[in-house]
């Protein structure tokens, strides 16, 4: 497996009750607007063929996509949570800016691309679904990167 570099987040990022609560509230609100319960974006399939030590790099890709292609286009919705959660996730993304893996990351890009394709295919409801899974994104980042 390729070696990961600088793929670490400080534990304290995930020990802030206020922003954790706001992230989960945002996910809950978006989830209640999601009528496509058959599709899961962040689940076993996302991590298939990706070793545990490569998963922070994978989650960095998912985080960046979520910020740029999901949260920004939907930034006027789900207030007041959105205006607090987006800067928090942007800080995490910035902290992972130097996270990369030495070697082939094709297997990771393939998995991330499947997630992106699913969101794009579902259109706005895909974006809502991604916001509804911010709790899973949060927990997966914590598991993968601390």
């Amino acid at each position: 497996a390729p070696v990961s570099s600088h793929c670490r987040l400080d534990k304290s990022n995930f020990q802030q009750p206020y922003i954790t609560n706001r992230t989960f509230m945002l996910a809950k609100e978006a989830s209640s607007a999601d009528n496509n319960t058959d599709v899961r974006l962040i689940g076993e399939k996302l991590f298939r063929g990706v070793s545990m030590s490569e998963r922070c790099y994978l989650m960095k890709q998912v985080l960046n996509f979520t910020l740029e292609e999901v949260l920004l286009p939907q930034s006027d919705r789900f207030q007041p949570y959105m205006q607090e959660v987006v800067p928090f996730l942007a800080r995490l993304s910035n902290s992972l800016s130097t996270c990369h893996i030495e070697g082939d990351d094709l297997h990771i890009q393939k998995n991330v691309q499947k997630l992106k394709d699913t969101v794009k295919k579902l259109g706005e409801s895909g974006e809502i679904k991604a916001i509804g899974e911010l709790d899973l994104l949060f927990m997966s980042l914590r598991n993968a990167c601390i």
């Epitope: 497996a1 070696v3 990961s4 962040i42 689940g43 076993e44 399939k45 991590f47 298939r48 070793s51 545990m52 030590s53 998963r55 927990m139 997966s140 598991n143 993968a144």
Partner: antibody, heavy 120, light 107 residues
Framework: EVQLQESGPGLVQPSQTLSPTCTVS????????VHWVRQHSGKSLEWMGR???????SYNSAFTSRLSITRDTSKSQVFLKMNSLQTEDTGTYYC??????????????WGPGTTVTVSS | DIVMTQTPSNLAASPGESVSINCKAS??????LAWYQQKPGKANKLLIY???TLQSGTPSRFSGSGSSTDFTLTIRNLEPEDFGLYYC?????????FGSGTKLEIK
């Protein structure tokens, strides 16, 4: 409460097929992966393969050519099939559930195992 | 495949004592090591994963440490129910592989 229970014939003839069943309760097979692990008498554990929550499978290359894992979600059962058995395949066969979707390679819940003897 | 070398094979201790079991991976597995307890007639029990995370229900007298290739399971203030077989397992990549086991016996 999460439970797994293996069952199957205790004695199998050499060259025949081993086919234990894992019956689960307390969780859905469409939400969690189930792994098969074997243990030779008094020896270490050996990971055989996995049934993913979406029905896909992964196998240990040491077994790939003679191993097959299938499931029946309506009966909450996962099946292991291994052909061309030799006496070295004697041992205890376990099924185990992964911890969650993220820690999918961590075996959090195990069945008590089913003992298989390969002998004529 | 990653080879897990577990030492010692056998260990004898008295209740109240502390013991350590070691596990060495043939290549780096970051922090992704799990420890299991095996007792006759009982289902195998996950004690620790990710090197040091206690599984729900695991008593606090159990602790795990280490990263990269070298890991240790420590049991402090041994209780009678702690005696049995212990296995390490790397859960970083496939195929999942286990150590050869350590038999912890009452002295």
């Amino acid at each position: 409460e999460v439970q797994l229970q293996e069952s199957g014939p205790g004695l199998v003839q050499p060259s025949q097929t081993l086919s234990p069943t894992c019956t689960v309760s307390g969780f859905s097979l469409t939400s969690y992966s189930v792994h098969w692990v074997r243990q030779h008498s008094g020896k270490s554990l050996e990971w055989m393969g996995r049934m993913w929550s979406d029905g896909d499978t992964s196998y240990n290359s040491a077994f790939t050519s003679r191993l097959s894992i299938t499931r029946d979600t309506s009966k909450s059962q996962v099946f292991l099939k291994m052909n061309s058995l030799q006496t070295e395949d004697t041992g205890t066969y376990y099924c185990a559930r992964s911890l969650d979707f993220y820690y999918d390679t961590t075996l959090a819940f195990w069945g008590p195992g089913t003992t298989v003897t390969v002998s004529s | 495949d990653i080879v897990m070398t577990q030492t010692p094979s056998n260990l004898a201790a008295s209740p109240g004592e502390s013991v350590s079991i070691n596990c060495k991976a043939s290549k780096t597995i970051s922090k992704y090591l799990a420890w299991y307890q095996q007792k006759p007639g009982k289902a195998n029990k996950l004690l620790i994963y990710s090197g040091s995370t206690l599984q729900s229900g695991t008593p606090s007298r159990f602790s795990g440490s280490g990263s990269s290739t070298d890991f240790t399971l420590t049991i402090r203030n041994l209780e009678p129910e702690d005696f049995g077989l212990y296995y390490c397992q790397q859960h970083n990549e496939y195929p999942l592989t286990f150590g050869s086991g350590t038999k912890l016996e009452i002295k």
